[in-house]
């Protein structure tokens, strides 16, 4: 679709004659008629195929003709055309004089013809004019012509239809030879499509505008390319959505069971030993004058036994004090007026002079202990098991019974189930009083994650085309993530080519 | 137990500014993205802003862009949504959610009451 | 963005009924939906998320199904805790969107 269009320039007929010889009466009132058609050879009568149109009365005789863009007696004349340019034309363009109406002389009777001329040949599109001027015996014609393409039509013959537009069907303006020139930030055939954040995960993230990014369900952060965890998650992490990968300390299936109840509560008190033990359990081993669950609880300040040689002990408010038995003195008791001569070593114990006679020193067998060998040695008094171990007396020894998971003379040490890597299929480990329990990534279960859940959606592979499969907040559930060129909830259907242009 | 306490509501005229926090426990705060929803008297909910758990990369609905913004101090275990410009149509009960713009909100607070009246 | 319609808007039942409110999508949601309760001056709880999964602690007579565009929250026999006011939520697309409410009443 374009426009032909001829600029008039200057007529001349200084006789002012008529073709036919004749004289015009009083001058030729000139006017013009235009036809404009396919390319002839040799140009014949018929129908103006490309066009024709008529002018007003221009001038008399011999007159210059001025542009003129509105109103009657246009100049350049438009010749609209509504097909493909096909680069070559007939002109044949005829000066008429009439007796009649100015404006419109074409309808006037007794009009007579000045003079005409024929032109064929080859006309690109283009803004340029072509100048021509034709002369015969009487008159003479300066003129120029063109052909452009009407508005939101392009290319060398104006068939390409380009309407520039920024809304839902697109976001382009138009180049010289009607290609789409997408506006900023857009992209695709008909620049439809959104250029996203620069580094915006390309199946994770989606745009629909551009330097956006909006993440897919199950992904976060700027770029898309950080995982959400399990919304049930209480103190875990994930490396894919909806996983709940645990915090140190913590375990079970969402992360909500403390196996470091220690740290997290510090519930011993008064300098306690806190050891755990498994979920939310663990043992305070209290310091010497507590005791109690948590060792919350004073024990008397006699409780510890500090009077010596067979003192008795007595409870003041903030101290104590030891009623010694005869022969001995001191704060604990723990000073002698006896010598070996008294025999004071009992349980076999043997005596030994100290200070030139004034005191002894008893040395005890083994299993035996105190001034004079009266205790009999608990091996047990100094909570020597860690981690909740039992105490037992083994005559001259003592042993330590420990609680399953621990290990070690003293029960110091943990027994990690874990070591030995029992869970499969990339399952996360967590140690309890129990044994060993795995949380299972998506598509599998059972106590090692060693099955495979056979209703993990995207193991019937449900999606097409190359689509990308993703389960849900559930293994049954999932989400094909197209390609560019599809779409369906599973990417079946070709996105189909518009049927024609929606402007 | 998971818990989220909002506070900082209150009266405030149009134009306005007001400063919500929300007091996170019960969860590892820092591994998780928060929201704000809100509820005008007597209608529905709607999202209005979330944040990312470790960039706090934030995400703001287009009714409030360019008005609000959405925070958060991981160290205090805290959410906050600073509200300027503020209009009348804002008035609603604000909501603290754990949750994501792409994820179910999990977990709500109580709410607090913001009301924006000359 | 989408929008999310919930049917009906209020609802009568008595304790022991089965009830179902619907949801509809404007666009296809996959199975990014989830649902809510609320109860008067309350916040709102989480029920049901990716479309039928039991959020933790809710009664298994809560079920929701569906897929798509078109989604359905059930509660086999109500109980007189369940008259609250239930929402639908789309995550599917940003932004998230939710139903305008079902009030559910006692008869």
């Known amino acids: 679709s374009g426009i032909f269009q001829l600029r008039l320039q200057e007529f001349a007929n200084e006789r002012g004659m008529l073709a036919n010889g004749r004289p015009c009466e009083p001058g030729c009132r000139t006017f013009f008629r235009i036809c404009l058609k396919h390319y002839q050879a040799t140009f014949s009568e018929g129908p103006c195929t490309f066009g024709n149109v008529s002018t007003p009365v221009l001038g008399t005789n011999s007159f210059v003709i001025r542009d003129k863009n509105s109103g009657s007696g246009r100049n350049p004349l438009q010749l609209p055309f509504n097909f493909t340019w096909p680069g070559t034309f007939s002109l044949n363009i005829q000066a008429w004089h009439t007796p009649g109406d100015d404006l419109r002389p074409e309808t006037s009777p007794g009009n007579s013809l000045i003079s005409q001329i024929i032109i064929q040949g080859s006309l690109a599109v283009g803004k340029n004019w072509k100048s021509d001027e034709q002369n015969n015996t009487l008159t003479r014609l300066r003129y120029s012509y063109r052909v452009v393409c009407s508005d939101n039509y392009y290319g060398d013959s104006c068939s390409r239809l380009c309407k520039k537009r920024d809304d839902h069907f697109g976001h382009y303006e138009c180049q010289p030879d009607g290609s789409l020139s997408c506006l900023p930030g857009w992209t695709g055939k008909y620049c439809d499509q959104p250029i996203c954040l620069s580094g915006c995960h390309e199946q994770n993230g989606y745009c629909s505008k551009p330097d956006e990014c909006n993440c897919r369900p199950g992904w976060q952060g700027p770029l898309c390319n950080e995982c959400i965890p399990h919304n049930g998650c209480r103190h875990g992490t994930c490396t894919i959505p909806w996983q709940c990968a645990c915090d140190e300390g913590w375990g079970g299936l969402f992360c909500d069971q403390d196996l470091n109840y220690c740290t997290h509560h510090s519930p011993c008190k008064n300098g306690s030993t806190c050891s755990n033990s498994g979920p939310r359990g663990y043992t305070c081993t209290c310091l010497p004058g507590y005791t109690g669950e948590h060792c919350e609880l004073e024990l008397s300040k006699c409780a510890s036994n500090p009077c010596r040689n067979g003192g008795s002990c007595k409870d003041h408010e903030n101290s104590y004090h030891c009623l010694c038995p005869p022969g001995y003195y001191g704060q604990h008791c723990e000073h002698s007026t006896l010598t070996c001569a008294d025999s004071p070593c009992f349980n076999g114990g043997s005596c030994r002079e100290r200070n030139q006679g004034a005191s002894y020193a008893c040395e005890c067998p083994p299993n035996f202990t105190g001034s004079n060998c009266e205790k009999k040695v608990d091996r047990c008094t100094s909570n020597p098991c860690a981690n909740g171990g039992q105490c037992l007396n083994r005559g001259p020894s003592r042993t330590c019974r420990c609680r399953p998971g621990f290990t070690g003379t003293h029960c110091e040490l943990h027994i990690s189930d874990c070591a030995r890597s029992p869970c499969a299929h990339g399952g996360t480990c967590h140690d309890l009083e129990n044994g060993p329990v795995c949380t299972c990534p998506a598509g599998f279960s059972g106590r090692r994650c060693e099955v495979r859940i056979t209703n993990d959606a995207c193991a019937s592979g449900p999606c097409f085309n190359g689509a990308t499969c993703y389960t849900g907040l559930s293994p049954n559930n999932f989400v094909c993530n197209c390609p560019y060129g599809f779409v369906g909830s599973r990417c079946e259907f070709p996105v189909g080519l518009p049927p024609s242009f929606p402007w | 137990e998971v818990q989220l306490v909002e506070s900082g509501g209150g009266l405030v005229q149009p134009g306005g500014s007001l400063r919500l926090s929300c007091a996170a426990s019960g969860f590892t705060f820092g591994n998780f993205p928060m929201s704000w929803v809100r509820q005008a008297p007597g209608k529905g909910l709607e999202w209005v802003a979330s944040i990312s758990s470790s960039d706090s990369w934030a995400t703001i609905g287009d009714s409030v862009k360019g008005r609000f913004t959405i925070s958060r101090d991981n160290a205090k275990n805290s959410l906050y949504l600073q509200m300027n410009s503020l209009r009348a149509e804002d008035t609603a009960v604000y909501y603290c959610s754990r949750g994501y713009y792409n994820s179910p909100f999990a977990y709500w607070g109580q709410g607090t009451l913001v009301t924006v009246s000359s | 963005d989408i929008q999310m319609t919930q049917s009906p808007s209020s609802l009568s039942a008595s304790v022991g009924d089965r009830v179902t409110i619907t949801c509809r999508a404007s666009e296809d949601i996959y199975s990014n939906l989830a649902w809510y309760q609320q109860k008067p001056g309350k916040a709102p709880k989480l029920l049901i998320y990716?479309?039928?999964n039991l959020a933790d602690g809710v009664p298994s007579r809560f079920s929701g199904s569906g897929s798509g565009t078109d989604f359905t929250l059930t509660i086999s026999s109500l109980q007189p805790e369940d008259f609250a006011t239930y929402y639908c939520q789309q995550y599917n697309n940003y932004p998230p969107t939710f139903g305008q409410g079902t009030k559910l009443e006692i008869k």
């Open positions: 990716d479309t039928n």
